[in-house]
Interface confidence: medium
């Protein structure tokens, strides 16, 4: 169905990290343009990315309004230069996206170790509280703001001189671990939302090692 010179979008895919959320689709347009609409299950459709030749649409501004809602998007195809033209059913061709619930599905961005501080045989490792694109009251909220105690961090640490890794977990952004005096350690962290069924873990942070500039040391 539809007009002979438009094809429906396909492979509609959500790409989302720390709530930065983009809908992608195919095909690259030939003599056609696209408009995207987004809605919650119970809400009205809102149009975005009007008559675009892109095959992606940034829907972040819509989904951050309520990250726990479930969203559905659809992509309309129109003939280039004649956007009033519709399909045989009297409507432009369109394709629905899969449902998307940002709180449950957005990928956790790669975390960063902000600092580590050694005091005797203890090391305090602090994870940077990543900024999201969820905006409330004139500021962007952090990952911890949004996920609260649903978010934990796993710390992997090992002596620079060996490969045997130890792990620690925290539901804050700080770890306090025991180390052997006089030994240098390396650290990597991972963000985890244990209650999730998909996209539960982030990629590991870049490795940071003692004896490099990142940390602070106070031997007591």
């Amino acid at each position: 169905s539809g007009t002979t010179n438009t094809v429906a979008a396909y492979n509609l895919t959500w790409k989302s990290t720390n709530f930065k959320t983009i809908l992608e689709w195919e095909p690259k347009p030939v003599n056609q343009v696209y408009t995207v609409q987004i809605s919650t299950k119970s809400g009205d459709w809102k149009s975005k990315c009007f008559y675009t030749t892109d095959t992606e649409c940034d829907l972040t501004d819509e989904i951050v309004k309520d990250v726990k809602q479930t969203y559905l998007a659809r992509v309309f195809s129109y003939p280039a230069g004649n956007v009033e033209s519709t399909g045989s059913a009297g409507e432009p061709l369109y394709e629905n996206s899969p449902e998307f619930t940002p709180y449950l599905e957005t990928n956790l961005g790669q975390p960063t170790i902000q600092s580590f501080e050694q005091v005797g045989t203890k090391v305090n490792v602090t994870v940077e509280d990543e900024r999201t694109l969820v905006r409330r009251n004139n500021t962007f909220l952090s990952l911890r703001d949004v996920f609260g105690k649903d978010l934990i961090y796993t710390l992997y640490y090992w002596k620079s001189s060996s490969s045997g890794k130890k792990t620690a977990k925290t539901n804050t952004n700080e770890f306090l671990i025991d180390v052997d005096k006089g030994e240098n350690y390396c650290f990597s962290v991972q963000a985890v939302i244990p209650s999730r069924t998909v996209n539960r873990k982030s990629t590991d942070s870049p490795v940071e090692c003692m004896g490099q500039e990142k940390g602070e040391f106070r031997e007591i």
């Epitope: 119970s42 309004k65 309520d66 990250v67 809602q69 509280d129 900024r131 969820v134 409330r136 009251n137 500021t139 909220l141 952090s142 911890r144 703001d145 949004v146 609260g148 804050t172 952004n173 700080e174």
Partner: antibody
């Protein structure tokens, strides 16, 4: 267990000053936004102001009715929240509550028991 | 500053009845509106956020609707434990509570 305990309320004359404290325990204080809310006798709730968390640089916001007179601060080493109230007016008479604020859905998820401030000559 | 006008200031209804409270914002607040329940001696409890999303654990007899400047809160099957004062709260630009609605059982 999360606990918030306010102190410092009392009777003060119009034009006077008072400093309220809120001792927090049972959670990582630096990770949370903290707020003051008040309730005048027989009246409804009124948001006074909040101070953001570490990730947001501990910045503050205030209701128009108290802006320029009240100052919110926090001492993270003591897990304490403060409300410095200057140039007090009779209409500032209220029970003052400190509350933990989850900003993403504007939820005051834990509250203190409140402390009464009476402004009267 | 955004003002919130809540009505009625009090209402009385029978168990099983449907009750409605309205809140009007002085300017467009999108859907950034919450509804709180406040019982004497307790901290206010969030029931609904972002106009219509039920907070976890809140009974489905509570609901909310609206957008822009006009909002409605409904209790569809009033229960004795629903006796409380209810407040709307806008969080589009800073925070502002409505004046409150005291709900009593007939």
């Amino acid at each position: 267990e999360v606990q918030l305990v306010e102190s410092g309320g009392g009777l003060v004359q119009p034009g006077g000053s008072l400093r309220l404290s809120c001792a927090a325990s049972g959670f990582t204080f630096t990770e949370y936004h903290m707020s003051w809310v008040r309730q005048a006798p027989g009246k409804g709730l009124e948001w006074v102001g909040f101070i953001r968390n570490r990730a947001q640089g501990y910045t503050t916001e205030y209701a128009a009715s108290v802006k320029g007179r009240f100052t919110i601060s926090r001492d993270n080493s003591k897990n304490s929240l403060y409300l410095q109230m200057n140039t007090l007016r009779t209409e500032d008479t209220a029970v003052y509550y400190c509350a933990r604020l989850t900003m993403v859905v504007a939820e005051f998820d834990y509250w203190g028991q409140g402390t009464l401030v009476t402004v009267s000559s | 500053a955004i003002q919130m006008t809540q009505s009625p200031s009090s209402l009385s209804a029978s168990v099983g009845e449907r009750v409605t409270i309205t809140c009007r914002a002085s300017q467009d607040i999108n859907k950034y509106l919450n509804w709180y329940q406040h019982k004497p001696g307790k901290g206010p409890k969030l029931l609904i956020y972002y106009t219509s999303t039920l907070q976890t654990g809140v009974p489905s007899r509570f609901s909310g609707s609206g957008s822009g400047t006009d909002f409605t809160f409904t209790v569809s099957n009033l229960q004795p434990e629903d006796i409380a004062t209810y407040y709307c709260l806008q969080y589009d630009n800073l925070l502002t509570f409505g004046q409150g609605t005291k709900l009593e059982i007939k």
